[in-house]
Interface confidence: medium
């Protein structure tokens, strides 16, 4: 289980029309539900229960979007549609690029991502808890504009990234 | 079908109070944020409050020029959300919409048909 | 707080596109969202997140945002498209969802 770092960029836009970015950066870890690659895309937050519907428009962005799902309680949710990695493919199927779960509230779903599986998904799957699932949640729930850089070594000066 | 329908509307004098229902149907009520959007005739749009989910805190929040004065609550077994308005004043005049949430978006892809809630003396 | 400010109103050619625009200081920082509303009917949602178009809105219903204004474009306006729309954003400090003043399309003809 590698060590993921992750840099999530809030893009506030100026009068002139530039933008300033705020890199913040955290760490993550890859699980062995997916792939150990890098990755970057606009940050869409996703309710586990928004995952469950096979024909639900409403999450279906262009590809190239990083999925953040904030896992409930088991107890909140004790009989989900789908398990945890069910639901990271879904977000896939959908165009996500990678999936950062918040796995504070249910720490379970660690083990049900890195049981490993016959057929794990070709992009990254990332968990998060703790302080480093804080600062993420944080920026997500602005509902600003925010773009995620997922690597798997750590990131060199962020203003080699995001060139607008 | 997916619907929310509001009820309880009607003429008030200011001062006194009035409770809106709204009714859901056809989705998972609890699952979901809910939001009070009202409109003066002839105005446009204007946003009065919301409610969360249970599952994420079944916060309210208020616009200003409401806040202390309306109460948003809901009754998950019943798939009712209220609003209850009290001190009421003329310029709360308006028909009044509940409005669902996309997840964690607050953008409202369902809304009820409104209901007129009048001031006056 | 942000304020959201739109033409009172817009016209335009059956056929032809229509842009509506809605502007508040780093407007481009947020997610807005557009809404029609035809007279004695409630808002219909008509794109989410700048340029998301709900399942059942026709295509040439579209949107961008940049910088300090947002724009929700119409092409090939149909008669349908008369109506008003609003612009909206959630404003996170504190919570509560900002409106437009909104904007009159007029379908000529």
């Known amino acids: 289980k590698e060590t993921a770092f992750v840099e999530v960029v809030l893009f506030e836009s100026s009068p002139s029309g530039d933008y300033t970015t705020y890199t913040t950066g955290l760490t993550g870890r890859f699980s062995r539900a997916g792939a150990t690659l890098s990755a970057e895309g606009e940050i869409v937050q996703m309710h586990p229960l928004g995952l469950c519907n096979n024909n639900d428009e409403e999450d279906l962005y262009e590809y190239g979007w990083v999925g953040v799902v904030k896992l409930e309680q088991p107890e909140l949710d004790p009989k989900p549609c789908l398990t945890v990695l069910g639901k990271a493919k879904r977000a896939v199927q959908r165009g996500a690029t990678a999936v950062i779960f918040d796995v504070s509230e249910n720490p379970e779903a660690i083990d049900q991502l890195n049981q490993g599986s016959e057929d794990p998904l070709k992009r990254p799957v990332v968990y998060v808890k703790g302080a480093d699932a804080i600062k993420l949640m944080n920026i997500v729930n602005k509902q600003k504009v925010a773009r995620a850089r997922i690597q798997h070594r750590p990131p060199r000066q962020p203003t080699e990234y995001f060139d607008m | 079908e997916v619907q929310l329908v509001e009820s309880g509307g009607g003429l008030v004098k200011p001062g006194g109070s009035l409770r809106l229902s709204c009714a859901a149907s056809g989705f998972t009520f609890s699952d979901y944020g809910i939001h009070w959007v009202r409109q003066a005739p002839g105005k446009g749009l204007e946003w009065v409050g919301r409610?969360?989910?249970?599952?994420?805190?079944?916060?309210?929040e208020y616009a200003a020029p409401v806040k202390g004065r309306f109460t948003i609550s809901r009754d998950d077994s019943k798939n009712t959300l209220y609003l209850q308005m009290n001190s009421l004043k003329t310029e709360d005049t308006a028909v009044y919409y509940c409005?669902?949430?996309?997840?964690?978006?607050?953008?409202?892809?369902?809304w009820g048909q409104g209901t007129l809630v009048t001031v006056s003396s | 707080d942000i304020e959201l400010t739109q033409p009172p109103s817009v016209s335009v050619s059956p056929g032809q596109t229509a842009s509506i625009t809605c502007s508040g200081d780093s407007l481009g920082s947020y997610y807005v969202h557009w809404y029609q509303q035809k007279p004695g009917q409630a808002p219909v949602l008509v794109i989410y997140?700048?340029?998301q178009r709900p399942s059942g809105i026709p295509e040439r219903f579209s949107g961008s945002n940049s910088g300090n204004t947002a724009t929700l474009t119409i092409s090939g306006t149909q008669a349908e498209d008369d109506a008003d729309y609003y612009c909206a954003v959630w404003d996170d400090e504190p919570h509560h969802d900002v409106f437009g003043g909104g904007t009159k399309l007029t379908v000529l003809g």
């Open positions: 997140r700048n340029k």
């Open positions: 409005a669902r949430a996309i997840y964690y978006l607050e953008a409202f892809d369902v």
């Open positions: 409610i969360k989910s249970k599952t994420d805190g079944g916060i309210t």
